[in-house]
Interface confidence: low
C-alpha cells in the first residue's frame, strides 16, 4: 500500500526515525512511515526530488533552496510558542545611548550568534545585501562582511580567511579558551552571547531573536553579566531607518523568520502528510508517551526530525515556499545565497560604438588589474534593442539603458535592473520630474481633468517632459483618444491651440504652432530650436508667462530657474515662483515646491539591465568595488568609469553625470525602476504605435 519515506540526515536521526516508524505502526497510523538515510539536508532534498524519498523537515534557508531549485513545497509547519505562532523575528539591537541606525551600520562593531545561523548571520547579512547597503563582489560574503563592519564576533568564523576581523570582538571563556568557537566556550556565542557582546560594550549592534533582550534583562537572567541590565536601555533598529522600543519587534525587525516546515514534492498530497503527522502528535507529543516526537534527549542530540521546542504541527494552507517564507525572509535569502561555483567568470558588457568599445576595453583591463570579479568582456551590438536581443539570447549579460529603453528591455525582453546611476542632487538634467504648470491667478482655476480646450505650451515635439510624458499621460488617462494612431491630430483637437516647436513640420497640424511666436522679427515660427522664443523648457514656461498659453509642460526646475531673480531676461525679471502652481494627477493644484508629490512622472535615471537569472547582487558588487577605485573623475588609478572625455565621446557605458552606481533596492523590475507614472505615460504613447 501507500507509504511515506522520511529522509534522515544522521545516525541519531535515523535511530529516532526508526523508533517513530515503529511507534506509528504499533498505533495503526496510516500510511506507514519508512526511513531513508541521506547524508545531509541538501542530499535529502535531492533524494526527494528524485522520488527516492518523500519528506523532510527543513529550516527557512533550506526551504528556499528546495523550493527555488527543486520545486518542493512546504505542507506542515512547526509551532513553537503561542505568542508568535509559526515564526519568530530577527532583530538588530543597539544601546539606547548610541546613535546607530540601519543606515549607519557601516564601520560599527557587530555581534552575531554564529556563522551561518539564521538570525545572527543569514537574515542580517542577506538583508543588508538585498537592500543594497552591503555590496558583495564575487560571492565572497565573508570578505564583504569583514570589510563592512568595524570588527565583529561571529562564532565559527575562526576557520575562515577573514577571522582577524570576524573574530576580533570574541573573548572565549573565562580562561581565554575557545575564542570564536561556535560553542558555549565562546562567551559571545548564541542569542544570549551576542546580546552580552553588545551589553558589555564589545559591540555596537547585536543580531538576535525578538525575545533575546527581554529574556536577558530586568533581573530575568542568572549570570552576573546580565543582572543589572535594563531592557529600556536597548532599542531595535527598524528597516526604515528609525529605532523602536525592544517590545516593538512585531513592527520593527529585519525579517520574520519562518518556522521549520516539512517539505515534499509538488505532486505529493500535503493533506496526507499532515494527517499522518497529526495522528502521531496526538499520541506521541505529551509527557509519558512511549515515543516522544518533539524530544531528542534519548538520542543524545538536539532537534532530530523536528525542533525540540515544537509545541505542535499545523497544516500549511498556501503550499508554496514563497508564501511560507514571507517576503522579508525571502528577500534576505536572495541577498545571501550566492554560490561562487555558479558564478560566471565573465560579465559580458554590451557596447554600441567604437569609442564605447575603447572605453569598455580599458575598463576590462583596469578591473582585471585590481582583481575585480567577475571579469569584464566587451561585446558590440548595433543598437540598444540589438543589445536587449543578445542579452535575452544569453550572448551578452549587461547594458546600461535610458528610461524608454529600460521599458522595452523589461516589457519585451524580460530584462531586470541590476544597478542604477545616481546623479548629483542639484543635477536636474538627468533625472527630473515632469510637471504641468499654470498661473495661480487664473480666475477660472482648472485642474488636470479640465485641460480640454485650454491653450498648451510644450518644449518641443518629442521632448520627454514637453511631449512624450504629458501626451502619453493624457492618452493613458483617456482624455486624448487618437483615431487611427494619429496622435498629432488628436492633440491638436484636444487643446484649443498650442506651441509645439518641431524640426520637420510636414503634415503638422497648424494648431500645434498657433501659439508660437518665432524670433524677435517674427520669423522662424515654430522651429525646433532656440530661434523660436517658446522653444525648450524655458520657452514653454515663457509661453505661459506671457499669457499665450494656459498650461506649460516642463521640468520641475523650470519655474525656479526663471523666477525670483534667477533669470534676468525682461520677460522673467519680475516673476515670482509663488504666482504659479502645478496641476496634480489627483485633480488638485499644488505649490511649485510640491513637485515630488504633484507631477506627471519622474524621468528615471539610467540603469544596468540584465537577464532575470543573473545574480544582480554580484553585478552591483562588482560596480560598487570598481567605483571605489575608478568612480571619482579625479582618481589616479588609471581609469575613469564616469568620464568619457578621453574617448572623444560622451556618456559611454555610463552617463558622464553619474556620481555613483547605486543598488536597485526594492525596484527589482523595470516597472519598479521606472515608476508607475512614467510607465503609464510610455504605455499611453506606445499604445499608439501602429
Amino acid at each position: 500500500g501507500m507509504e511515506v519515506r522520511w529522509c534522515a540526515t544522521s545516525d541519531p536521526e535515523q535511530h529516532k526515525c526508526g523508533n517513530m516508524s515503529e511507534a506509528f505502526r504499533e498505533a495503526g497510523i496510516q500510511p506507514s512511515l519508512l526511513c531513508v538515510r541521506g547524508t545531509s539536508a541538501d542530499h535529502c532534498v535531492q533524494l526527494i526530488a528524485a522520488q527516492e524519498a518523500d519528506a523532510i523537515t527543513l529550516d527557512g534557508g533550506a526551504i528556499y533552496e528546495a523550493g527555488k531549485e527543486h520545486g518542493l513545497k512546504p505542507v506542515v509547519g512547526e509551532v513553537y510558542d503561542q505568542e508568535v505562532g509559526t515564526s519568530y523575528y530577527a532583530v538588530a539591537v543597539v544601546r539606547r545611548s548610541s546613535h546607530v541606525t540601519i543606515d549607519t551600520l557601516k564601520g560599527v562593531k557587530s555581534c552575531h550568534t554564529g556563522i551561518n545561523r539564521t538570525v545572527g548571520w543569514n537574515v542580517p547579512v542577506g538583508y543588508l545585501v538585498e537592500s543594497g547597503r552591503l555590496s558583495v563582489m564575487g560571492c565572497d560574503v565573508l570578505k564583504a562582511v569583514s570589510d563592512y563592519f568595524g570588527g565583529s564576533c561571529v562564532p565559527g568564523a575562526g576557520e575562515t580567511s577573514y577571522s582577524e576581523s570576524l573574530c576580533r570582538l570574541c573573548r572565549g571563556d573565562s580562561s581565554g579558551e575557545g575564542v570564536c568557537d561556535k560553542s558555549p566556550l565562546e562567551r559571545y556565542y548564541d542569542y544570549s552571547g551576542a546580546f552580552r557582546c553588545l551589553a558589555e560594550g564589545a559591540g555596537d549592534v547585536a543580531f538576535v531573536k525578538h525575545s533575546t533582550v527581554l529574556e536577558n534583562t530586568d533581573g530575568k537572567t542568572l549570570p552576573s553579566w546580565g543582572q543589572a541590565l535594563l531592557s529600556q536601555d536597548f532599542e531595535l533598529l527598524c528597516r526604515d531607518g528609525s529605532r523602536a522600543d525592544v517590545t516593538e519587534w512585531r513592527q520593527c525587525h529585519l525579517a520574520r523568520v519562518p518556522a521549520h516546515a516539512v517539505v515534499v514534492r509538488a505532486d505529493t498530497d500535503g493533506g496526507l502528510i499532515f494527517r499522518l503527522l497529526n495522528e502521531g502528535q496526538r499520541l506521541f507529543s505529551h509527557e509519558g508517551s512511549s515515543f516522544q516526537m518533539f524530544s531528542s534527549e534519548a538520542y543524545g542530540q538536539k532537534d532530530l526530525l523536528f525542533k525540540d521546542s515544537t509545541s505542535e504541527l499545523v497544516p500549511i494552507a498556501t503550499q508554496t515556499y514563497e508564501a511560507w517564507l514571507g517576503h522579508e525572509y525571502l528577500h534576505a535569502m536572495k541577498g545571501l545565497l550566492c554560490d561562487p561555483n555558479r558564478l560566471p567568470p565573465y560579465l559580458r558588457w554590451c557596447v554600441l560604438s567604437t569609442p564605447e568599445i575603447q572605453k569598455c576595453g580599458d575598463m576590462a583591463v583596469a578591473f582585471r588589474r585590481q582583481r575585480l570579479k567577475p571579469e569584464i568582456q566587451c561585446v558590440s551590438a548595433k543598437s540598444p534593442q540589438h543589445c536587449m536581443e543578445r542579452i535575452q539570447a544569453e550572448q551578452v549579460d549587461a547594458v546600461t539603458l535610458s528610461g524608454e529603453d529600460i521599458y522595452t528591455a523589461g516589457k519585451t525582453y524580460g530584462l531586470v535592473p541590476a544597478a542604477g546611476e545616481h546623479y548629483a542632487p542639484e543635477d536636474s538634467s538627468n533625472s527630473y520630474y515632469v510637471v504641468a504648470v499654470v498661473r495661480r491667478d487664473s480666475s477660472h482655476a482648472f485642474t488636470l481633468d479640465e485641460l480640454r480646450g485650454k491653450r498648451s505650451c510644450h518644449a518641443g515635439f518629442g521632448s520627454p517632459a514637453g511631449w512624450d510624458v504629458p501626451v502619453g499621460a493624457l492618452i493613458q488617462r483617456g482624455f486624448i483618444r487618437p483615431k487611427d494612431c494619429d496622435v498629432l491630430t488628436a492633440v491638436s483637437e484636444f487643446f484649443n491651440a498650442s506651441c509645439v516647436p518641431v524640426n520637420n513640420p510636414k503634415n503638422y497640424p497648424s494648431s500645434l504652432c498657433a501659439l508660437c511666436v518665432g524670433d524677435e522679427q517674427g520669423r522662424n515660427k515654430c522651429v525646433g530650436n532656440s530661434q523660436e522664443r517658446y522653444y525648450g523648457y524655458r520657452g514653454a514656461f515663457r509661453c505661459l508667462v506671457e499669457n499665450a498659453g494656459d498650461v506649460a509642460f516642463v521640468r520641475h526646475t523650470t519655474v525656479f530657474d526663471n523666477t525670483n531673480g534667477h533669470n534676468s531676461e525682461p520677460w522673467a525679471a519680475e516673476l515670482r515662483s509663488e504666482d504659479y502652481e502645478l496641476l496634480c494627477p489627483n485633480g488638485a493644484r499644488a505649490e511649485v515646491s510640491q513637485f515630488a508629490a504633484c507631477n506627471l512622472a519622474q524621468i528615471p535615471p539610467h540603469a544596468v539591465m540584465v537577464r532575470p537569472d543573473t545574480n544582480i547582487f554580484t553585478v552591483y558588487g562588482l560596480l560598487d568595488k570598481a567605483q571605489d577605485l575608478f568612480g571619482d573623475d579625479h582618481n589616479k588609478n588609471g581609469f575613469k568609469m564616469f568620464d568619457s572625455s578621453n574617448y572623444h565621446g560622451q556618456d559611454l557605458l555610463f552617463k558622464d553625470a553619474t556620481v555613483r552606481a547605486v543598488p536597485v533596492g526594492e525596484k527589482t523590475t523595470y516597472r519598479g525602476w521606472l515608476g508607475l507614472d512614467y510607465v503609464a505615460a510610455l504605455e499611453g504613447m506606445s499604445s499608439q504605435q501602429c
Partner: antibody, heavy 117, light 107 residues
Framework: QVQLKQSGPGLVQPSQSLSITCTVS????????VHWVRQSPGKGLEWLGV???????DYNAAFISRLSISKDNSKSQVFFKMNSLQADDTAIYYC???????????WGQGTLVTVSA | DIVLTQSPATLSVTPGDSVSLSCRAS??????LHWYQQKSHESPRLLIK???QSISGIPSRFSGSGSGTDFALSINSVETEDFGMFFC?????????FGAGTKLELK
C-alpha cells in the same frame, strides 16, 4: 514689519451688505495676495476668497454669488464686500497673507461683525 | 470639499504633559496641511507648515507629522502659554478648509 489692519462696522442689518478694508504695511500688494477668512461659533474657520497680486480673484464657491474682493495697490488697501447678510453670517472676519511657502503666516486683528436688526 | 476632522474636541492636560492632537482628511492631501494656534481674543498663529516643517519663532516643543490622510501635532511638555484652540488647514485643493479645532485646556 508685515502688518494687516482691518477697519469696518461691527453691526450690520439683515439683508444689508458688509464692507471691510484691510490696510497693509511692510509689503506691496503687487507682490502678495491677500486672503479673507471668517470664524463663527457655529461653523468654525471658513476660507472666503483671495485677491492675487495680479488682481485676479478666487472665491469659495459657497460665497461666489455675494462676495467681491478688490484692491488699490497704491493705497495698500484691500476691499472686502459681502452682500445679503443673514444672522448666520455673524462672525469675526480676518484678512491674511501667505509668506512665500507658508500659508497664512500673517493675520489682521479681525473684525467682529454682528448681523442683527 | 475636503473635510478635516480634528480629535479630540477638548484635551485637558497639566503643564509638563506631552500631548498629540489629531487631524484626519476626508481624502489624501499629501503633506499639504498646516497647524495654527489661537488664544482667546487673538488671531490664529501659524505653528507648522506642510505637515512637519517648523516655523521660525515657534518653540521647538511643537512638532508635526503625517502624510496622506492622517496628521498629528505634538507638544512636548506643555507650558501654560500653550493653552487655547488648535486648528489644522489644508492647502491641497480649493476651497481651502479648516478643521473644527481642538481645545487644549488646563486640567
Amino acid at each position: 514689519q508685515v502688518q494687516l489692519k482691518q477697519s469696518g462696522p461691527g453691526l450690520v442689518q439683515p439683508s444689508q451688505s458688509l464692507s471691510i478694508t484691510c490696510t497693509v504695511s511692510g509689503f506691496s500688494l503687487s507682490s502678495y495676495g491677500v486672503h479673507w477668512v471668517r470664524q463663527s461659533p457655529g461653523k468654525g474657520l471658513e476660507w472666503l476668497g483671495v485677491i492675487w497680486s495680479g488682481g485676479n480673484t478666487d472665491y469659495n464657491a459657497a460665497f461666489i454669488s455675494r462676495l467681491s474682493i478688490s484692491k488699490d495697490n497704491s493705497k495698500s488697501q484691500v476691499f472686502f464686500k459681502m452682500n445679503s447678510l443673514q444672522a448666520d453670517d455673524t462672525a469675526i472676519y480676518y484678512c491674511a497673507r501667505r509668506n512665500n511657502s507658508a500659508w497664512f503666516a500673517y493675520w489682521g486683528q479681525g473684525t467682529l461683525v454682528t448681523v442683527s436688526a | 470639499d475636503i473635510v478635516l476632522t480634528q480629535s479630540p474636541a477638548t484635551l485637558s492636560v497639566t503643564p509638563g504633559d506631552s500631548v498629540s492632537l489629531s487631524c484626519r482628511a476626508s481624502q489624501g492631501i499629501s503633506n499639504n496641511l498646516h497647524w495654527y494656534q489661537q488664544k482667546s481674543h487673538e488671531s490664529p498663529r501659524l505653528l507648522i507648515k506642510y505637515a512637519s516643517q517648523s516655523i521660525s519663532g515657534i518653540p521647538s516643543r511643537f512638532s508635526g507629522s503625517g502624510s496622506g490622510t492622517d496628521f498629528a501635532l505634538s507638544i512636548n511638555s506643555v507650558e501654560t502659554e500653550d493653552f487655547g484652540m488648535f486648528f489644522c488647514q489644508q492647502s491641497n485643493s480649493w476651497p481651502l478648509t479648516f478643521g473644527a479645532g481642538t481645545k487644549l485646556e488646563l486640567k
